[in-house]
């Protein structure tokens, strides 16, 4: 003989795989003080409960340790807590209050639990900017994970030098000391939910700030093929009157500011070009000597120089007296 009561709230609840959900249940107000029963949550159509506070009753193997009856008769609470939700938990459930000593029990209405695919992904947060050679703490967090669930397993993947920092149920810290070559490389945080056997990941591209490591000059002479200078050059022969285009490029992130100077500049010298390009339309005596390209960057500067040696055309000298 059963007395029926209605579960408050929605007729169905949705939970994502690996996460938690609370199925709300309140004992009927008509329940007499003398009714000392045990509470049982059942999967519709099953005889073995998924959760109970009856010490003599077995629960289903599949739900043991994941489904818990939150029993508080004073607050009339008979809610069901589900953690580490699995696809096969997708079903209808009902609550039953029963005592073998009493004639009647109390049975609730049914409530459906819908288990959906996990769509949440981990978040990776970086405090400020990543600077080459300086350690930074990256945090991979899963704030949507419930505290009472089986703690997720965090895995990090990166080519950069790293070490693991502290972790909580919902986050893991990775200390990274990036190098210039780690700029634009991938860093992945992978989170596995062992209770449900689900894995999610997020990948970011590292944006590493670093000072210029290399600076080079490409030289374009007339229509001839360009060639590149990678280190300071003592002397580059150039024919008088020839057009010369000097192109300076440097690495560094963010990009370094490139400028050209004639001679070996002091720190506050005025550049002859504020870009990486220096156009010399007609090389003459004024251009003989040193030209310096400076790559300026907040994290450090680098420069490269080349020395122009002008070859004079024979007829050019004779006609000039």
């Amino acid at each position: 003989q059963e007395r029926r009561f209605q579960l408050e709230g929605p007729e169905s609840l949705t939970v994502q795989e690996g996460l938690c959900v609370l199925v709300p249940c309140r004992l009927p107000t008509t329940l007499p003080a003398s009714y000392y029963g045990y509470g049982y949550w059942f999967l519709e159509g099953a005889d073995v409960p998924v959760a109970t506070n009856d010490p003599d009753e077995e629960v289903q193997e599949e739900t043991r340790g994941r489904f818990h009856l939150l029993w508080d008769p004073r607050r009339k609470n008979c809610s069901l807590s589900i953690r580490d939700a699995r696809r096969r938990d997708n079903a209808a459930y009902f609550f039953r209050l029963k005592s073998k000593w009493m004639k009647y029990g109390y049975t609730s209405s049914k409530l459906s639990v819908r288990v959906m695919a996990l769509t949440h992904r981990p978040n990776i947060s970086i405090p400020g900017t990543l600077e080459s050679g300086h350690p930074s703490n990256l945090t991979c967090s899963v704030p949507w994970v419930c505290e009472q669930g089986t703690p997720p397993i965090f895995s990090w993947m990166s080519a950069a030098p790293t070490s693991l920092g502290p972790r909580t149920t919902q986050s893991s810290v990775l200390t990274i000391t990036p190098r210039p070559q780690d700029h634009s490389t991938n860093l992945t945080c992978q989170v596995t939910f062992p209770g449900a056997g689900v894995t999610m990941e997020r990948t970011i591209q590292l944006n590493v700030s670093y000072a210029p490591q290399k600076v080079a000059i490409s030289i374009f002479q007339g229509n001839s093929a360009a060639f590149k200078i990678l280190q300071n050059t003592s002397s580059l022969p150039v024919l008088e009157g020839q057009a010369l285009r000097l192109l300076c490029d440097a690495d560094g992130n963010p990009p370094a500011h490139l400028s050209w100077f004639q001679g070996f500049p002091a720190l506050n010298a005025t550049p002859i070009s504020n870009t990486g390009v220096l156009e010399l339309p007609q090389v003459g005596s004024a251009e003989e000597g040193d030209f310096t390209c400076r790559a300026q960057h907040p994290l450090g500067s680098l420069q490269i120089s080349l020395s122009l040696f002008v070859h004079w055309k024979p007829e050019g000298r004779a006609g000039g007296v």
């Epitope: 007499p32 003080a33 003398s34 009714y35 000392y36 506070n53 010490p55 003599d56 029993w71 508080d72 008769p73 004073r74 005592s99 073998k100 000593w101 009493m102 004639k103 009647y104």
Partner: antibody, heavy 114, light 107 residues
Amino acid sequence: EVQLVESGGGLVQPGRSLRLSCAASGFTFSSYGMHWVRQAPGKGLEWVAVISYDGSNKYYADSVKGRFTISRDNSKNTLYLQMNSLRAEDTAVYYCANYGMDVWGKGTTVTVSS
Amino acid sequence: AIRLTQSPSSLSASVGDRVTITCRASQSISSYLNWYQQKPGKAPKLLIYAASSLQSGVPSRFSGSGSGTDFTLTISSLQPEDFATYYCQQSYGTPFTFGPGTKVDIK
């Protein structure tokens, strides 16, 4: 008015038997489990036995197991305690109570003495 | 069997005093604990059921708390009619044992 009234107590010699009754009124007796609880003179309460609403489940304290039998007659709204092989230490006031122990009888005194 | 111990076994108090009685179970009994008051020559009276629920008709100066193994009965302001013996009892599982009792008398 909800009421439980015990009867059947008295003076009995060790080794003899006695049957206690508990008459219920004012509630649906057949829906409730029932208890017997006793209290020796100057001592605390001791739970004795419980019976389910239909008599199919019974449980006893170790001190009375095998000697006492709890039973009920739902048609008569009456609970019983059959006490055999009585001992001096069974001397007590015997109370019947409903399953939640929110309703108690006034008790009946059993004295086991030679 | 689940054993219940009560402390203190007796106490002397004055009218208006706050009185606290504790009951400890030998294993977890969730919230399946009840408190009774008994006066000499009378049947016990249910005060608190399910550890903290006040039985209908019982004055609000009585309150219960706890769950698992440790429970407390508190009388916020002792009245003359509260001098009696108090028992805890577990209904978690058979046998349904009682504590040994705490006698509250006048100081």
